[in-house]
């Protein structure tokens, strides 16, 4: 025997109180798949959350964050404060990157400058709090016999 509820499309629910008739989802609720016995409550974007997409009868609302904050987590489940470039967010707020580290974004952590010498390169441009160093080409690339056409770099082993 086929379940009569399986005929109820997205945007409706199978109403047990009305002989399993397909009823439209009430306001501020939705069903994104057919055959559902209840509609889900729409997400509300409040406070630091901002509505990116309104709720409809077939899809949930989508939130993002107000200016000065950025999304974290699946579906923007949290909003985290932005910092300036050259800073990272700590428990005590935004703090400048320590010497030798940088952050070129408004989010995330300060990362160490690249150590150019590990790849046999030299520093062309010094790093700042907001920018990594720029490593120059390897000395072999600069010698008189250097070819302009560079072969692909060998794949690095994981962890190197």
């Amino acid at each position: 025997l086929q379940d009569p509820c399986s005929n109820c499309p997205a945007g409706t629910f199978c109403d047990n109180n009305r002989n399993q008739i397909c009823s439209p989802c009430p306001p501020n609720s939705f069903s994104s798949a057919g055959g559902q016995r209840t509609c889900d409550i729409c997400r509300q974007c409040k406070g630091v959350f901002r509505t990116r997409k309104e709720c409809s009868s077939t899809s949930n609302a989508e939130c993002d964050c107000t200016p000065g904050f950025h999304c974290l987590g699946a579906g923007c489940s949290m909003c985290e404060q932005d910092c300036k470039q050259g800073q990272e967010l700590t428990k005590k707020g935004c703090k400048d990157c320590c010497f030798g580290t940088f952050n070129d974004q408004k989010r995330g952590i300060c990362r160490p400058w690249t150590n150019c010498s590990l790849d046999g390169k030299s520093v062309l441009v010094n790093g700042t709090k907001e920018r990594d160093v720029v490593c120059g080409p390897s000395p072999a690339d600069l010698s008189p016999g250097a070819s302009s056409v560079t072969p692909p770099a060998p794949a690095r082993e994981p962890g190197h």
Epitope: L124, V125, R131, D132, C135, G136
Partner: nanobody
Framework: QVQLVESGGGLVQAGGSLRLSCAAS????????MAWYRQAPGKQRELVAL???????KYADSVKGRFTIARLNAKNTVNLEMNSLKPEDTAVYTC??????????WGQGTQVTVSS
């Protein structure tokens, strides 16, 4: 590997101007810097100018005040404007894409000859 195609080289009289252009096959923001190098016959390739992702520029002392490097982000292109050219600027000019985590990518180069 990114493809870099240079254009704009040629023969020019001392005191003249040229604009070199380097078109990249991928987003130039993915590189730590874009640069122009030059190499005269029998000499080592030397840095002429570079521009970083945040627009910081660096020039060889010998070209300061005469050459200007600029990015056209929408076109993934880097230009080198060369004014008051001197015979000693004669060289093959090559565009380079510098990525700290990888080997430098080079274009094929374009010849610039400055006659006196």
């Amino acid at each position: 590997q990114v493809q870099l195609v240079e254009s704009g080289g040629g023969l020019v009289q001392a005191g003249g101007s040229l604009r070199l252009s380097c078109a990249a096959s991928e987003n130039i923001f993915s590189f730590n810097a874009m640069a122009w190098y030059r190499q005269a016959p029998g000499k080592q390739r030397e840095l002429v100018a570079l521009i970083t992702g945040d627009g910081t520029t660096k020039y060889a002392d010998s070209v300061k005040g005469r050459f200007t490097i600029a990015r056209l982000n929408a076109k993934n292109t880097v230009n080198l404007e060369m004014n008051s050219l001197k015979p000693e600027d004669t060289a093959v000019y090559t565009c380079a894409a510098l990525r700290n985590s990888d080997r430098t990518s080079w274009g094929q180069g374009t010849q610039v000859t400055v006659s006196s």
